[in-house]
């Protein structure tokens, strides 16, 4: 009997393995070399959303595309080989410390030449997956004493970027204290970044499991061919059907002039480290990219005079500075941006169960993306929050928050 792999169906160096097919026959499964994916490894991943890193291994967006950030001692596109090992080798033994989350490693005679004995609460070949929800009802306390001093210094210290450490006191989560605080299912923060549907985490409170349970999950990014075009033509008054998708930001509602607005509750407030005039010059691109990330429509909130509510954000002045120095005009280092969320098309789409009902839930989602290093947004965000009521008077925003 010919092996289903005889015809070498896997492209781009993917490994073919026979597997049981329907009706008892044999078919094949391709194990793709990154960044390729698809049934025959025929597609190239253009974003982390499309790249299948081994469970527990984070994906990083690099200038050359998405890459799996292998743990120390492992390398290769799928983090299965030693640095310097021949291509295709999968001989990661205990020397490479392959067991994650405190698991202990034992050598084994067969590939991959190791076996992990996992610590409590973890499972999988490399202890990469959380076991059934542990008995403990809360995340462990912050294990590193040094993290206390680093909280709130506006730098994301990776070693403190965990729920127990409050995501480095919010420094890694855009100042959102705990993006998953409303989520009753424990461990959802761990599963948020795994590109797999985890039904227990797919509720609004658990931030929709990063849309992993949404139809077509891995293909839900704006087609790179359209991306620049859609940003240029966002909210330009003409309907571009190629951009009129949730993953491309609904074309700035250009195709929805007859559909009544459906605003989410509250105002989404972002501090962006670009001065207002610079931000407003690229406002269509800014709003299109953010709308695409949130899969709904964003626009500037207008003040009573019909002007976009984009206010200067000044460099915080240390309290110890001499009074005369403080009275000089403070340096504008960014913008405080107030946005409305219009769910008219999100709620009209066939699966309308993934819209953000209020600004705070959208802020939590952005904070979560930032915490797991998956916020693919070219504008430097300092913090994000939802304001439930009327925002304060503009003058308030001319000072440090």
């Amino acid at each position: 009997v010919l092996s289903p792999c005889e015809s070498q169906p896997c492209q781009h160096g993917g490994q073919c393995r026979p597997s049981p097919g329907p009706g008892g026959g044999l078919t094949f499964t391709c194990h793709c070399a990154q960044p390729f994916w698809g049934p025959r490894c025929e597609r190239v991943a253009r974003s982390c959303r499309e790249l299948q890193c081994p469970v527990g291994v984070p994906c990083q967006q690099t200038p050359r595309g998405p890459r799996c950030a292998c743990p120390p001692g492992l390398s290769g596109p799928s983090c299965r080989s030693f640095p310097g090992s021949p291509p295709g080798a999968s001989n990661a033994s205990c020397a490479a410390a392959p067991c994650l989350h405190g698991g202990s490693c034992r050598p084994a005679p067969l590939a991959p030449f190791f076996r992990c004995a996992c610590a409590q609460g973890w499972t999988g070949p490399r202890c990469e997956a959380p076991a059934a929800a542990p008995e403990v009802s809360e995340e462990p306390r912050c294990p590193r004493a040094a993290c206390q001093a680093k909280r709130g210094d506006q730098r994301c210290d990776r070693e403190c970027n965990s729920p127990g450490c409050g995501w480095d006191g919010g420094d890694c989560s855009l100042s959102v204290g705990d993006p998953w605080r409303q989520c009753e299912a424990l461990q959802c923060w761990r599963l948020f970044n795994n590109s797999r549907c985890d039904p227990a985490c797919s509720s609004p409170a658990c931030l929709y499991d990063n849309f992993d349970c949404h139809a077509g999950g891995r293909e839900r990014t704006c087609n790179p061919v359209y991306e620049k075009y859609c940003a240029d033509h966002f909210a330009d008054g003409r309907c571009d059907q190629g951009c009129n998708t949730e993953e491309c930001g609904w074309d700035g509602l250009d195709c929805a002039s007859e559909v009544p607005a459906l605003l989410a509750r509250g105002v989404l407030v972002l501090t962006v480290l670009l001065p207002p005039e610079e931000l407003l010059r690229s406002s269509a691109d800014f709003l299109q990219r953010l709308s695409a990330i949130l899969r709904t429509s964003l626009r500037f909130r207008l003040d009573a005079h019909g002007q976009a509510m984009v206010f200067p954000y000044h460099r915080p002045s240390p309290g110890s500075e001499p009074r005369a120095r403080r009275e000089l005009a403070p340096e504008v280092i960014g913008s405080v941006v107030m946005l409305e969320i219009d769910n008219r098309l999100c709620l009209q789409s066939p699966e309308n169960d993934h819209c953000f009902p209020d600004a705070q839930s959208a802020a939590d989602y952005l904070g979560a993306l930032s915490a797991v290093e998956r916020l693919d947004f070219p504008y430097p965000l300092r913090d994000v929050r939802g304001e439930p009521l009327e925002p304060p008077e503009p003058s308030h925003h001319h000072h440090h928050h």
């Epitope: 330009d236 003409r238 929805a256 002039s257 406002s283 500037f300 019909g306 002007q307």
Partner: antibody, heavy 119, light 107 residues
Framework: QVQLVESGGGLVKPGGSLRLSCAAS????????MHWVRQAPGKGLEWVGR??????????DYAAPVKGRFTISRDDSKNTLYLQMNSLKTEDTAVYYC??????????WGQGTLVTVSS | DIQMTQSPSSLSASVGDRVTITCRAS??????LNWYQQKPGKAPKLLIY???NLQSGVPSRFSGSGSGTDFTLTISSLQPEDFATYYC?????????FGQGTKVEIK
């Protein structure tokens, strides 16, 4: 009904300035992208520029011959579109039209106002 | 900038004739093309948007076709009120540009 009415045209010397207005009525002006188009006497149509709504930052785009000299702005509280024209040249002589951009096309035009640049 | 070239620049036709005007873009503009009719002393009037969509209120004798770089406006049976100048216009990318116009005159 939906209407656009331009005003402010007239005779101006080369190097001078002029501000055209376009008063809108019959629709929610603030939500629309608005355009200026001009037509020199006996010639074809030429796109001048556009402005997005303020909810999307009021971004402006211009045709190369007017970039740096003309400025499009809007006052949503007055339902009015403006075209500020500085450093005018004789080749800017034209009828200037304002137009509303609908979701799929530019569907409403004003009647036009004539600007003559001559010494 | 995207150049739009119309042909012919003028034509003479009789009532009842089938008239075809073509428009060529210097690069692909997908279906982002509009056709306008303008009569002397009046503002342009939109006939066709997005290459082939008839604007509401426009008689069905007007039709548009094409995509990419080559487009056509057809008047199936010319009527007296159709004698005017016709312009194509791309709104694929700013600066939006018009063709130089085609004047349809009575033979």
């Amino acid at each position: 009904q939906v209407q656009l009415v331009e005003s402010g045209g007239g005779l101006v010397k080369p190097g001078g300035s002029l501000r055209l207005s376009c008063a809108a009525s019959g629709f929610t002006f603030s939500t629309y992208v608005m355009h200026w188009v001009r037509q020199a006497p006996g010639k074809g149509l030429e796109w001048v520029g556009r402005i997005r709504s303020n909810t999307y930052g009021g971004i402006t785009d211009y045709a190369a011959p007017v970039k740096g000299r003309f400025t499009i702005s809007r006052d949503d509280s007055k339902n009015t579109l403006y075209l500020q024209m500085n450093s005018l040249k004789t080749e800017d002589t034209a009828v200037y039209y304002c137009a509303r951009a609908e979701a799929r096309y530019r569907d409403v035009w004003g009647q036009g106002t004539l600007v003559t640049v001559s010494s | 900038d995207i150049q739009m070239t119309q042909s012919p620049s003028s034509l003479s036709a009789s009532v009842g004739d089938r008239v075809t005007i073509t428009c060529r873009a210097s690069q692909s503009i997908s279906s982002h093309l509009n056709w306008y009719q303008q009569k002397p002393g009046k503002a342009p009037k939109l006939l066709i948007y997005a290459a082939s969509n008839l604007q509401s209120g426009v008689p069905s004798r007007f039709s548009g076709s094409g995509s990419g770089t080559d487009f056509t406006l057809t008047i199936s049976s010319l009527q007296p009120e159709d004698f005017a100048t016709y312009y194509c216009q791309q709104d694929y990318h700013t600066p939006f540009t018009f063709g130089q116009g085609t004047k349809v005159e009575i033979k």
